[in-house]
């Protein structure tokens, strides 16, 4: 039950996280005009990964896409790449994790397969979250560097009558959305990995031993409270009672860490 809850919660948290990563990637407010010295401005600039915009005091907003690929800063390209990789991995992770959910029955899929899929999706979520956090952090670092550079330029006057006041940019809402979303995806991935451990605990498997009784022959297959580890196909987790005794060869299909004859 706890395993199912952990897996389900991990899936939901990751789903929210990936939705957040997609939202952050699409948002225009990765960087916004710094209004520290001038809280009321006639022209408010903000920029995203794909386009830059201006909101005028008139209420009109106009955006302009970055129609060049080669002319863009390498850092921006890197951030785009990180975010896209994060989204792609997250999307694949979500797809895998849907089939891995314990509460969803798909044909005769073994719990062992579900455990493996849970682990795979968990790792994908972790990498996806790290990609998003890395992308946002790289962009934030770029902003901080540019902020101080433009601040320095702002106070080294032009000498003449004409001033060129550089627009300084600070952190936009998308950065915070990205950090939170990346963190959630990461947490969701960790939860999926924990759930996988619950689905596949380290345990001792006993080789089936045949007991020959005077009446009915009973073959006892150990497995007690095992969920499923990929080591056996007894998915119902109950003792197998058979009319006749099994040969040792027949039971050999259940390998275990320690063989007791």
């Amino acid at each position: 039950m706890a395993v199912t809850a952990c897996q389900g919660l991990g899936f939901v948290v990751s789903l929210i996280g990936i939705a957040g990563i997609i939202a952050a990637t699409c948002m225009d407010q990765w960087s916004t005009q710094d209004l520290y010295n001038n809280p009321v401005t006639a022209v408010f600039n903000y920029q995203g990964l794909w386009r830059s915009c201006v909101r005028e005091s008139s209420g009109f907003t106009e955006c302009r896409g970055y129609f060049t690929l080669l002319g863009l800063p390498a850092m921006l390209q890197a951030v785009r790449a990180l975010m896209i990789v994060g989204i792609v991995l997250g999307a694949i992770g979500l797809l895998v994790s849907i089939f891995a959910l314990k509460c969803i029955r798909i044909g005769s899929m073994e719990d062992s397969a579900k455990a493996n899929m849970t682990l795979t999706s968990g790792i994908m979520f972790i990498v996806s979250g790290l990609c998003a956090i890395a992308g946002v952090s790289v962009f934030a670092n770029m902003l901080v560097t540019n902020f101080w550079m433009s601040t320095a330029n702002m106070y080294t006057g032009m000498g003449g009558m004409v001033q060129t006041v550089q627009t300084r940019y600070t952190f936009g809402a998308a950065l915070f959305v990205g950090w939170v979303a990346g963190g959630l995806t990461l947490i969701g991935g960790v939860m999926m990995c924990i759930a996988c451990r619950g689905l596949a605990p380290e345990e001792t498997n006993y080789k089936a031993v045949s007991y020959h009784a005077s009446g009915h022959s009973v073959a006892y297959k150990p497995g007690g409270f095992k969920a499923s580890t990929g080591f056996g196909s007894n998915t119902k987790n109950k003792k197998i009672y058979d009319g006749g005794a099994r040969t040792e060869d027949e039971v050999q299909s259940y390998p275990s860490k320690h063989d007791y004859v």
């Epitope: 005009q33 001038n38 009321v40 401005t41 006639a42 022209v43 408010f44 600039n45 903000y46 920029q47 830059s52 915009c53 201006v54 005028e56 005091s57 008139s58 209420g59 009109f60 106009e62 955006c63 302009r64 004409v162 001033q163 060129t164 006041v165 627009t167």
Partner: antibody, heavy 118, light 113 residues
Framework: QVQLVQSGAEVKKPGASVKVSCKAS????????VNWVRQAPGQGLEWIGM????????RLNQQFKDKATLTVDTSTSTVYMELSSLRSEDTAVYYC???????????WGQGTLVTVSS | DIVMTQSPDSLAVSLGERATINCLSS????????????LTWYQQKPGQPPKLLIY???TRDSGVPDRFTGSGSGVDFTLTISSVQAEDVAVYYC?????????FGQGTKLEIK
């Protein structure tokens, strides 16, 4: 068609107050900011401030912060500008104008001449 | 505040001739977000309110004849009337729409020679 109709000319004594109105029609009143600009006789244009009819949000030129008060009556689609503590140098034609894209003023009222004279 | 300086103060041209009015801003009017210049040109005839001619430095308002052309970027802007007509006699103003307070140039008076 878009129209901004201003109130008639006013003659006031120094120290008095005057309230100039600007009635808008022909467009969605609450969607556009309305500006006020003044022009002293034979002089250039001077921006006073602007008001947004939907929330009565204002932007005022600091030179006029103690002089002009901008208000809105959405029920009549009218913008008001009250000028206080009038002095002779406040004698001017006062225009209201709608703010358009590019922070440009696309439609103007006919102007209201305010004369301050003792 | 941004200071807008127009030149010349007055200009006399013959009918059909080209007229050029310059406007210099004390600060760049270029918005980095959309690469637009927030400069507007107005025409004011005697006894009338100003009329919008050009916004965003080069975008003609609807109904404005194509003989009026705006150009320039950053701090230096020009209004050109390619072939002056009698009805173009007016005072022309440039305006900063980039930052508060919005400021106007002192005006350039266009007359017919």
């Amino acid at each position: 068609q878009v129209q901004l109709v201003q109130s008639g000319a006013e003659v006031k004594k120094p120290g008095a107050s005057v309230k100039v109105s600007c009635k808008a029609s022909g467009y969605s009143f609450t969607n556009y900011w309305v500006n006020w600009v003044r022009q002293a006789p034979g002089q250039g244009l001077e921006w006073i401030g602007m008001v947004h009819p939907s929330g009565s949000e204002t932007r005022l030129n600091q030179q006029f912060k103690d002089k002009a008060t901008l208000t809105v009556d959405t029920s009549t689609s009218t913008v008001y500008m009250e000028l206080s503590s009038l002095r002779s140098e406040d004698t001017a034609v006062y225009y209201c104008a709608r703010v358009w894209s590019g922070n440009a003023f696309d439609y103007w009222g006919q102007g209201t001449l305010v004369t301050v004279s003792s | 505040d941004i200071v807008m300086t127009q030149s010349p103060d007055s200009l006399a041209v013959s009918l059909g001739e080209r007229a050029t009015i310059n406007c210099l801003s004390s600060q760049s009017l270029l918005a980095s977000g959309n690469q637009r210049n927030y400069l507007t040109w107005y025409q004011q005839k005697p006894g009338q309110p100003p009329k919008l001619l050009i916004y965003w430095a080069s975008t003609r308002d609807s109904g404005v004849p194509d003989r009026f052309t705006g150009s320039g970027s950053g701090v230096d802007f020009t209004l050109t009337i390619s072939s002056v007509q009698a009805e173009d006699v007016a005072v022309y103003y440039c305006q900063n729409g980039f930052s508060f307070p919005f400021t106007f140039g002192q005006g350039t008076k266009l007359e017919i020679k």
